[in-house]
């Protein structure tokens, strides 16, 4: 029977700069029941606080709700593991909420084949930003990426859409069924997961010729 091994805070993520969650990996438990606590203070503060919510983010997590989240402050946090034989502490982690944003995937992905008489046919893709993100405030710039592939293909074709919420793709294989997905990322932060796939059947008469 031993004191617990050193835990590690390995990830902090925020969906929208308004709340965030951090997760830690326990070290070895020393063969004994081990209790974990996350303590933090904000840069410039002397008072330490303990995690306000160990439940929302699942096991080995700390969730900071709206009232505990400030964009303009760096959080300095540490996890303490304690059993009957002693304690061990993680390294301190410095967290700036601005840089840990990972949005939810974009919503309302719509895909349509457009075949104008006077121009080349194209695939028209449209989506909406994730609900939790308020783009009106100007705090966020979201960038988008689209990926698509024929249903049975192994490789994805990736297109960067910038800040647009719609995109046209010209070169497609007629008669194929395509999967289309979109994801987003803030200017500082992480790519969201890909949105659920939308399927589109490309007509056999879809021509790529001029």
């Amino acid at each position: 029977q031993l004191p617990p091994g050193k835990p590690e805070i390995f990830k902090c993520r925020s969906p929208n700069k308004e709340t965030f969650t951090c997760w830690w990996r326990p070290g070895t438990d020393g063969g004994l029941p081990t209790n974990y606590s996350l303590t933090y203070h904000r840069e410039g503060e002397t008072l330490m606080h303990e995690c306000p919510d160990y439940i929302t983010g699942g096991p080995n997590s700390c969730h900071f709700g709206k009232q505990y989240t400030s964009m303009w402050r760096t959080y300095i946090m540490m996890v303490n593991a304690t059993n009957q034989m002693g304690s061990s502490f993680s390294d301190e982690l410095y967290v700036d909420v601005t840089y840990i944003v990972q949005p939810d995937p974009p919503l309302e992905l719509a895909v349509e084949v457009k075949q104008p008489e006077d121009r080349k046919p194209y695939l028209w893709i449209k989506w909406s930003p994730p609900t939790l993100i308020d783009l009106k405030t100007g705090w966020f710039t979201l960038l988008y990426e689209i990926r698509l592939k024929p249903e049975k293909a192994a490789e994805w074709e990736i297109h960067f859409a910038g800040q647009q919420t719609e995109f046209k793709i010209l070169s497609l294989h007629p008669g194929q069924k395509y999967l289309v997905q979109v994801r987003c990322k803030p200017d500082h932060g992480y790519w969201s997961a890909w949105s659920p796939a939308t399927f589109i059947q490309i007509p056999s008469d879809f021509t790529m010729n001029d």
Epitope: N35, S37, T39, G44, E45, T46, L47, M48, H49, E50, C51, P52, D53, Y54, I55, Q67, Y68, N80
Partner: antibody
């Protein structure tokens, strides 16, 4: 509606012990640090002790250190203050208060009176 | 320990008056200061936190300002229900401390 209800106060002789309780309802008790604050008759407020969400951070005023012990039971939504070696100067109304770490002591109980007298 | 000094200790005022209470900290506490109102036989009630943020449900005639070592609580137009004792509290470092209080009485 948030409610904090203290109990356990009463008359005790110097050197005696008392255990105060604070029952919380209408809040996610486990998400907040909790505090005891006291007020001697006709006097101001004095912070006594605080305890964090999972009891990993505990602090006491110098005047009670070594004599009082704060604890909590999140499963029972309850806060406690074990008071030993009581002195005349511990006579006061004892309040429990919720500490919203983003703000201050935003909810208080109605208080329980502790009288230490021979 | 950080000492908080409130001034004045007593204040006589009339309904409609503008009232200002000052709280000085013995060392800098940034904006980690709260103001409470207490009526006889009742628990304190939070009015202002982080020096200037009005607690939900508190009338807008109450306002707070200051940072560092000097803070003020202002009641823009005193109402009958505002006659009470007011305390400041620092939440910058342990031990958490309160000011001595300011009793606002009817003139």
């Amino acid at each position: 509606e948030v409610q904090l209800v203290e109990s356990g106060g009463g008359l005790v002789k110097p050197g005696g012990s008392l255990r105060l309780s604070c029952a919380a309802s209408g809040i996610t008790f486990s998400s907040y640090s909790m505090n005891w604050v006291r007020q001697a008759p006709g006097k101001g407020l004095e912070w006594v002790s605080s305890i964090s969400t999972r009891s990993s951070l505990i602090h006491y005023a110098d005047s009670v250190k070594g004599r009082f012990t704060i604890s909590r039971d999140n499963a029972k939504n309850s806060l406690y203050l074990q008071m030993n070696s009581l002195r005349d100067e511990d006579t006061a109304v004892y309040y429990c208060a919720r500490w919203d770490a983003a703000a201050a002591f935003d909810y208080w109980g109605q208080g329980t009176l502790v009288i230490v007298s021979s | 320990d950080i000492q908080l000094t409130q001034s004045p200790s007593f204040l006589s005022a009339s309904v409609g008056d503008r009232v200002t209470i000052t709280c000085w900290a013995s060392q800098g506490i940034s904006s980690y200061l709260a103001w409470y109102q207490q009526k006889p036989g009742k628990a304190p009630k939070l009015l202002i936190y982080v020096a200037s943020t009005l607690q939900s449900g508190v009338p807008s005639r109450f306002s707070g300002s200051g940072s560092g070592t000097e803070f003020t609580l202002t009641i823009s137009s005193l109402q009958p229900e505002d006659f009470a004792t007011y305390f400041c509290q620092q939440l910058n470092s342990y031990p958490l401390t309160f000011g001595g209080g300011t009793k606002v009485e009817i003139k």
